[in-house]
Amino acid sequence: EPPTACREKQYLINSQCCSLCQPGQKLVSDCTEFTETECLPCGESEFLDTWNRETHCHQHKYCDPNLGLRVQQKGTSETDTICTCEEGWHCTSEACESCVLHRSCSPGFGVKQIATGVSDTICEPCPVGFFSNVSSAFEKCHPWTSCETKDLVVQQAGTNKTDVVCGPQDRLR
């Protein structure tokens, strides 16, 4: 009696259980009563990542440099290519199909967390006593200069965008 179900890594065809092709290989011809399943390795730039009965291998993903992408991990006959973003860019989605430039923190804001290949820069407003006078994807808020430690006095108050201006103390005659 012909089988209705097959073992793991087999498939049912023409009332017969045939072996699936291993990852990295595609199906050329089904097994018969007298012959084994015929499989062939995937070609260059192709892969299959499961035991399968596919007649065509999948093409490796292309990491398009025009979208800011580069190869992070080459694909093999059994795995797809993994793309990542060039330095200074990060992925727009989990699948990393394109990249955008890391955001810069404007003057008055500092970098709380530097961007990675998968996350953007996180900015924070400079609190009282700190400032940032540049637009940067790396610079944190800097503390105001302490005039006292230099034996100077504050001549101009600092803001979130500017440092304090120190000057000499008025000498009593």
């Epitope: 260059e44 398009d64 440099p65 992408l69 580069r70 190869v71 080459k74 060039e86 330095e87």
Partner: antibody, heavy 119, light 109 residues
Framework: QSLAESGGRLVTPGGSLTLTCTVS????????MGWVRQGPGKGLEWIGT??????TDFATWAKGRFTIAKTSSTTVDLKMTSLTTEDTATYFC???????????????WGQGTLVTVSS | AFELTQTPASVEAGVGGTVTIKCQAS??????LAWYQQKPGQPPKLLMA???NLASGVPSRFKGSRSGTEFTLTISDLECADGATYYC???????????FGGGTEVVVK
């Protein structure tokens, strides 16, 4: 299509040198480029690769002392610092088969330029 | 660190003969192996990529194959012009190792 290296010369230990690869019939906006060196009577040694985006990757031993940059639409420079006698070699520039990857094979090579590090 | 071990370092054969050069990778590099030919005073010339794909203009006397992490370059019907040094190169990842094998000198008698 051709590549030509220039800038090789005698340099003293501790010195710096910049080599230039000038390409003809090759589009540096679509082709990745690499540098490979060969010591006298020795084998080939990969130095680094530059992708079309300008991103670079280097062999571990070359990181920090070597930089690669596209300096025009037809030139790629290899800058070398803190040179030692071990850096004496013929330096080749070569076109990579892929433009988005650090690790490539090279399908077109220049004739090479000789760098001698000696006191 | 990743290593490519090329054997033999030197091989001699007569015109019309066959030579076999092996390249052993210390870890899986899938099909990412290229072969080059280099003659004295000249730059290397690409012979083959993806373990077995002939570069354009390379005669079919050159054949590449792969078995796991072992790669083989076979040159049959040897000609005098085949006398050169042959290098394999992994382009899967550098992984701190030299991406080139040590080279094999082929002497044609």
């Amino acid at each position: 299509q051709s590549l030509a290296e220039s800038g090789g010369r005698l340099v003293t230990p501790g010195g710096s040198l910049t080599l230039t690869c000038t390409v003809s019939g090759i589009d540096l906006s679509t082709d990745g480029m690499g540098w490979v060196r060969q010591g006298p009577g020795k084998g080939l040694e990969w130095i680094g690769t530059i992708r079309v985006t300008g991103g670079t990757d280097f062999a571990t031993w070359a990181k920090g002392r070597f930089t690669i940059a596209k300096t025009s639409s037809t030139t790629v420079d290899l800058k070398m610092t803190s040179l030692t006698t071990e850096d004496t070699a013929t330096y080749f520039c070569a076109r990579g088969h892929a433009n988005n990857d650090a690790y490539v094979y090279f399908n077109l090579w220049g004739q090479g330029t000789l760098v001698t590090v000696s006191s | 660190a990743f290593e490519l071990t090329q054997t033999p370092a030197s091989v001699e054969a007569g015109v019309g003969g066959t030579v076999t050069i092996k390249c052993q990778a210390s870890q899986s590099i899938d099909r990412y192996l290229a072969w080059y030919q280099q003659k004295p005073g000249q730059p290397p010339k690409l012979l083959m990529a993806a373990a077995a794909n002939l570069a354009s203009g390379v005669p079919s006397r050159f054949k590449g194959s792969r078995s796991g992490t072992e790669f083989t370059l076979t040159i049959s019907d040897l000609e005098c012009a085949d006398g050169a040094t042959y290098y394999c190169q992994s382009y899967f990842t550098s992984d701190d190792g030299n991406t080139f094998g040590g080279g094999t000198e082929v002497v044609v008698k």
